[in-house]
């Protein structure tokens, strides 16, 4: 028998320097996970420790903090670099910064191969592109030799920017001649590492023929057996094993997202490259591991970038940004709109001529809203401005919703409305009129929708049956603020971009704002 | 673009140690196979063995236990040693990379141009 | 090993002519082969891999096929340039092994 040892991270999301339990920006050092420079000292611990180590990123390095911001992937080729990845599978938001923000900083620079045999180039992009990504890649580990096979989302197109020139196919029909053609190499040993969330993982461990292990990514899924280390409620049992049709069992990995964990399998094969047994667990990264101080310095070199970027203008507003808790949580307020038209913008994906874009519609929770922005500081915005208004760390998902959870969502937005309370919804591309002489549940009186198909937008009424794309923060997308109809009734659920780098692309490229309070949301008369 | 640049003495003495270097310029080692190739004159081409960029070797049985190839990727170079030479390993060597799109060192581009090793005393 | 056989280990051509040239593998290779183009005094050229798949740069003139044992390389109108040394190559297995190679020269 042979022993592998996977260790494996998905959507760290930009997390290189340790955060808080929540992911978010460390306060108290003590209490501080994750990061790079605590990932490499476990690595390598392990790395010394045992014979044969392969360590995989399953997608989505890019996109989550002000370092993606500024370096734009350069700082995950250099840090991926030093910690010795053997392999990373394409996800979603790598295309975030569209083809030449992946080829140039990251593709070019990788030490490692970076893998996707469901992401196909074609015309002019087919050339430049050629081998700087592999559908699968062999890797010598010990004496013995692994294949690993890559995969990507194929709803890549409407969650991220890989234009015209990539075609996204489905992940089983594109793995399995990829896999037989490892198998005419005699590689025996095939690990399938993609980013298409923990349901398409599955389908590939029970579908596709010959792979013997799933690394997965992009549902930020935590799986652990036994009593879980920290926050996370686990999915299952880590390994999460599936039968596949042709009667093997496959061990499905993932490792919950933005760097928190190392996942840690221990696979043993017999001669003839079958799993006799699978076993293993997340690590947690707390601050008992301690951070590699080479790693470490390095970080600290790169920040310096990061603290002089945050007080550069990034445009101006010629109006009063009203984000106060006195508007947003009881009426439409300005701050709310530029951020929904924020959201909107940075989804536009022009993907289907039958419609002018594939979303219309945002919610977000006025307590999500921190602060104003005052114009009278010669109008300047300032990511740090930004920070203040959202300083969350979130992100702006995009969600699939029955027209009836939809109408729920604002039933539960005005349910104890006067009392402050952060459940209070701004909008972009809704229209919504309330009645709080009536009871809580049956105060919407009017619910009009942006139409997606259609070559001239308008505003029609919502269909309770309908299906609709919505863009909204991940905390309500995962039922903050009580809005757990919206966890409960989610058809589809893709994780986008950091909240405030959504909002500081939108205001870069527009260079000045002034946004207005403009009807969106209004409550009929004798009401309000 | 990718360049390699074989070094080395031309002349080694039979029974010593042939030891070549390869450069590598305006790329990374790392993510690569890295391959020894050699073609005596006026023959066809054989090859000797490849080094992953990580380390890993893996060599033509028919020469394994005199050949010995190593990496180091602080200088981005890649060494061949065969030992106990004899005139018939008397050949032209090149290095070579696996090509961008091979997965598994199954064919090369770019190549070196080649340095002729005579084996005589 | 796996034995791979070239022939004919010599042709005489004319500029314009269409010529072929067979690779045999001792066993299945699949698509694993890759043919070069070698020059006198310099190192070989990556012409064609994975039996069929034209590499950057080269022109379309040439062209491969086959799968299992049987392999041709086709050049559909020889140029000047062309004559040279052509030799497959098999990448199926270990250790990777050459055909013996077959000089085109001018008529």
């Known amino acids: 028998a042979w022993e592998l040892t996977i260790l494996h991270t998905n959507d760290v999301h930009s997390r290189l320097e340790q955060t808080s339990e929540d992911s978010s920006k460390c306060v108290n050092a003590s209490r501080c996970m994750g990061g790079v420079a605590r990932l490499f000292t476990k690595v390598q611990q392990i790395r010394r420790a045992e014979p044969n180590v392969l360590l995989l990123d399953a997608g989505d390095q890019y996109q989550g903090t002000i370092w993606f911001t500024v370096y734009k992937g350069a700082e995950v080729a250099h840090f991926m670099n030093a910690l010795r990845y053997d392999a990373m599978a394409l996800g979603n938001h790598e295309f975030d910064n569209g083809v030449e923000g992946l080829i140039e900083p990251l593709l070019k620079e990788a030490k490692f191969p970076i893998l996707s045999a469901n992401i196909k180039a074609k015309g002019p992009l087919a050339s430049q592109i050629s081998g700087l990504y592999l559908p699968y890649k062999v890797l010598p580990v010990g004496d013995e030799v692994v294949g690993i096979v890559g995969y990507t989302s194929k709803e890549t197109p409407f969650l991220s920017n890989p234009g015209t020139n990539l075609v996204f196919e489905d992940e089983i029909t594109a793995l399995q001649p990829e896999v037989d053609k490892l198998k005419t190499l005699n590689v025996n040993k095939i690990i399938a590492l993609g980013h298409s969330g923990f349901e398409m993982d599955k389908l590939i461990a029970q579908k596709v023929r010959g792979v013997d292990v799933v690394v997965g990514g992009h549902s930020n899924t935590f799986l652990y057996t036994g009593n879980p280390p920290s926050k996370e409620v686990p999915a299952g049992k880590y390994p999460f094993i599936v039968t596949s049709d042709d009667g093997r069992k496959v061990p499905v990995v993932q490792a919950y997202a933005f760097g928190k964990y190392l996942g840690y399998l221990k696979i043993e094969f017999d001669e003839r490259g079958n799993v006799i047994s699978s076993h293993g667990n997340p690590i947690l990264l707390n601050s008992s591991i301690p951070e590699d101080p080479s790693i470490k310095a390095d970080i600290n070199k790169w920040r310096i970038k990061l603290d002089n970027y945050s007080t550069q203008e990034l445009g101006k507003t010629i109006v009063y940004l009203d984000g106060s808790s006195q508007s947003c949580r009881f009426r439409e307020c300005n701050m709310g709109n530029l951020i929904c038209d924020a959201m909107i913008n940075n989804n536009l994906r022009h993907t289907d001529e039958m419609f002018w874009n594939h979303v219309s519609m945002c919610i977000l929770n006025g307590g999500g809203i921190r602060s104003p922005i005052d114009e009278r500081n010669n109008g300047t915005i300032t990511w740090e401005n930004l920070a203040a208004v959202l300083p969350f760390g979130g992100t702006f998902d995009l969600v699939q919703l029955k027209g009836s959870t939809l109408k729920k969502a604002f039933e539960h937005s005005v349910h104890r409305y006067g009392q402050s309370t952060g459940e209070f919804l701004q909008v972009g591309g809704i229209h919504v009129v309330y009645d709080l002489s009536r009871k809580p549940g049956d105060r919407v009186v009017k619910l009009d929708v942006l139409c997606t198909k259609c070559r001239v937008p308008s505003y029609d009424p919502l269909k309770m049956d309908e299906v609709y794309k919505v863009i909204l923060p991940n905390f309500l997308a995962n039922g903050g603020d009580g809005f757990q109809m919206i966890k409960d009734e989610l058809l589809r659920h893709d994780s986008g971009d950091q909240d405030i780098n959504v909002v500081s692309t939108y205001i870069s490229k527009m260079k000045v704002i002034y946004p207005a309070v403009e009807g969106r949301i209004k409550f009929s008369t004798g009401s309000h | 673009q990718v360049q390699l640049q074989e070094s080395g003495p031309g002349l080694v003495k039979p029974s010593e140690t042939l030891s070549l270097t390869c450069t590598v310029s305006?790329?990374?080692?790392?993510?690569?196979?890295w391959s020894w190739i050699r073609q005596p004159p006026g023959k066809g081409l054989e090859w000797i063995g490849y080094i992953y960029g990580r380390g890993s070797t893996n060599y033509n049985p028919s020469l394994k236990s005199r050949v010995t190839i190593s990496v180091d990727t602080s200088k981005n170079q890649f060494s061949l040693k065969l030992s106990s030479v004899t005139a018939a390993d008397t050949a032209v060597y090149y290095c070579a990379r696996e090509s961008q799109e091979s997965p598994y060192n199954n064919w090369f581009d770019p190549w070196g141009q080649g340095t002729l090793v005579t084996v005589s005393s | 090993d796996i034995q791979m056989t070239q022939s004919p280990s010599s042709v005489s051509a004319s500029v314009g002519d269409r010529v072929t040239i067979t690779c045999r593998a001792s066993q299945g290779i699949s698509s694993w082969l890759a043919w070069y183009q070698q020059k006198p005094g310099k190192a070989p050229k990556l012409l064609i891999y994975a039996a069929s798949s034209l590499q950057s740069g080269v022109p379309s003139r040439f062209s491969g096929s086959g799968s299992g044992t049987d392999f041709t390389l086709t050049i559909s109108s020889l140029q000047p340039e062309d004559f040279a040394t052509y030799y497959c190559?098999?990448?199926?297995?270990?250790?990777?092994?050459f055909g013996g190679g077959t000089k085109v020269e001018i008529k």
């Open positions: 305006g790329g990374s080692i790392e993510r690569y196979y």
């Open positions: 190559q098999q990448g199926n297995s270990f250790p990777r092994t």
